[in-house]
């Protein structure tokens, strides 16, 4: 009499998350009689996935009618696969008894679950930095399987090389996460720049996922200050101009000081944007020269984006 064999023809099966997995198993003989059970894993901690005999297994369907007398196909279909279903599944034949006695196991079928990575999320630095400084951007994506994944960084379409990437966990897991940190050197022209984190994975069919961050959130371009005097007007008034140029962001407060005393304070708002994303602002101050006996020291004081104030002074000559 031929010895019973339990045959699991596939060593491995790969299924996309959300799909159904079919795990095949056949026995070479009807005898000795006894049920088949499916387990994930081996040893005392193995998990019962399906039993012909009893239990409620809502996601598992036998491929063939298990109540048929001469059934030797013990394949099962598991619906709505998630990464948590990954593992090695064993089809195990039992001999009837009280209790049933384990007789023979199939060689096992490893189920791997292909799960898409989540959309990459790119986060920038908490505080703004100025040109020539290096800032870090972090990109994170989660829940993918298998572990192999490719991550690239781009700045305005140019690939970056200064980044460090980790995929966790290092060992076997049902799903994985990736975290990458890129270092970007800022320039004054980066207000309109963008960094892109691009993730490529087998589940994405060559259509990578992208996460973006605008450098406008990370950069501060400090203003240039220039104070000039227009020609004296007929009414003895001098028009002094403070030109604040090429700054970003728009958050700016300008204060005029006459001989150290506050004359006027203004806040920048609704400024037109330069091509490069920066802003310019011009403020005028009329000084009545006839009201002064001595030269007048005018100071244009600019406080930009919460930074320490920058001053530019100019002396208006009062002729005796």
């Amino acid at each position: 009499e031929e010895e019973l064999q339990v045959i699991q023809p596939e060593k491995s099966v790969s299924v996309a998350a959300g799909e159904s997995a079919t795990l095949n198993c056949t026995a070479t003989s009807l005898i000795p009689v006894g049920p088949i059970q499916w387990f994930r894993g081996v040893g005392p901690g193995r998990e019962l996935i399906y039993s012909q005999k009893e239990g409620h297994f809502p996601r598992v369907t036998p491929v063939s009618d298990p109540t048929k007398r001469n059934n030797m196909d013990f394949s099962i279909r598991i619906s709505n696969i998630t990464p948590a279903d990954a593992g090695t599944y064993y089809c195990v034949k039992f001999r009837k008894g009280s209790p049933d006695v384990e007789l023979k196991s199939g060689a096992g079928t490893e189920l791997s679950v292909r799960a898409k990575p989540s959309a990459p999320v790119v986060s920038g630095p908490a505080v703004r930095a100025t040109a020539e400084h290096t800032v870090s951007f972090t990109c994170e994506s989660h829940g993918f399987s298998p572990r192999d994944i490719t991550l690239k960084w781009f700045k305005n379409g140019n690939e970056l090389s200064d980044f460090q990437t980790n995929v966790d966990p290092a060992g076997k897991s049902v799903s994985y996460s990736i975290r990458s940190t890129a270092r970007v050197v800022l320039t004054r022209r980066d207000v309109h720049s963008q960094v892109i984190c691009e993730v490529a994975h087998v589940t994405l069919q060559g259509d990578p996922l992208r996460g973006t961050a605008n450098l406008s959130e990370a950069i501060r371009v400090p203003p240039f200050l220039e104070v000039t005097q227009q020609s004296m007007r007929a009414d003895n008034q001098v028009n002094v101009t403070c030109q604040v140029t090429k700054f970003y962001p728009q958050r700016l407060q300008l204060t005029w000081l006459e001989n150290g005393n506050v004359s006027r304070t203004e806040m920048a708002s609704a400024l037109p944007e330069n091509k490069d994303g920066t802003y310019n602002w011009t403020s005028w101050l009329l000084v009545n020269v006839s009201a002064h006996r001595d030269d007048v020291k005018l100071t244009c004081q600019v406080e930009h984006d919460g930074q320490p104030a920058v001053n530019k002074s100019f002396s208006v000559k009062v002729s005796a």
Partner: antibody
Framework: QVQLVQSGAEVKKPGASVKVSCKAS????????ISWVRQAPGQGLEWMGW????????NYAQKLQGRVTMTTDTSTSTAYMELRSLRSDDTAVYYC?????????????WGRGTLVTVSS | DIQMTQSPSSVSASVGDRVTITCRAS??????LAWYQQKPGKAPKLLIY???NLQSGVPSRFSGSGSGTDFTLTISSLQPEDFATYYC?????????FGGGTKVEIK
């Protein structure tokens, strides 16, 4: 052909023992368990116990525990049921039956039955 | 132990009639129920196994249904050779138990 042939009728006195045999042919004897079922005159079917030659497993009905022994001889493909300390209410037709379900218990092949009469 | 309750205990019917016998288990037994036919002086004969599967060689006028605790044996058109006693049997666990039987008699 596939069949179970039982030993002949027995008349026993109370307190005696009886051993009924059931010879299988036409199939792999060790592949299927054998149950013993009895039926008192005019009554229904009562399961007595079960034996699986493949591993020597047995399971007996609680009420017969200690009085019944089921054995097999694989060399002759024969199952035996011995009932001791016979009482008058043990008078019945004793059937052996092949149990063929993989995950469940049912009997697809029966012997013709052996009448055991217990009478003083 | 799982108790099996059969009803009715007897039924009188004519040839050609549709006959239904029910069996109730004291607890859930999934689909593990068998039906047997027994004629006087003969061994029982398996008709239906696993609640609804027709045993090889059994006429198709016999059918079974149900799962859990409530089961039915139906003879769609009674034939002269069908007058007999019918038993249900739970095959879910030890001890195996039988219903009390239903005698189908000629009206």
């Amino acid at each position: 052909q596939v069949q179970l042939v039982q030993s002949g009728a027995e008349v026993k006195k109370p307190g005696a023992s009886v051993k009924v045999s059931c010879k299988a042919s036409g199939y792999t004897f060790t592949g299927y368990p054998i149950s013993w079922v009895r039926q008192a005159p005019g009554q229904g079917l009562e399961w007595m116990g079960w034996i699986y030659a493949y591993g020597g497993n047995t399971n007996y009905a609680q009420k017969l525990q200690g009085r019944v022994t089921m054995t097999t001889d694989t060399s002759t493909s024969t199952a035996y049921m011995e009932l001791r300390s016979l009482r008058s209410d043990d008078t019945a037709v004793y059937y052996c039956a092949r149990e063929a379900g993989s995950s469940w218990y049912d009997f697809d092949l029966w012997g013709r039955g052996t009448l055991v009469t217990v009478s003083s | 132990d799982i108790q099996m309750t059969q009803s009715p205990s007897s039924v009188s019917a004519s040839v050609g009639d549709r006959v239904t016998i029910t069996c109730r288990a004291s607890q859930g037994i999934s689909s593990w129920l068998a039906w047997y036919q027994q004629k006087p002086g003969k061994a029982p004969k398996l008709l239906i196994y696993a609640a609804s599967n027709l045993q090889s060689g059994v006429p198709s006028r016999f059918s079974g249904s149900g799962s859990g605790t409530d089961f039915t044996l139906t003879i769609s058109s009674l034939q002269p050779e069908d007058f007999a006693t019918y038993y249900c049997q739970q095959g879910a666990s030890f001890p195996i138990t039988f219903g009390g039987g239903t005698k189908v008699e000629i009206k």
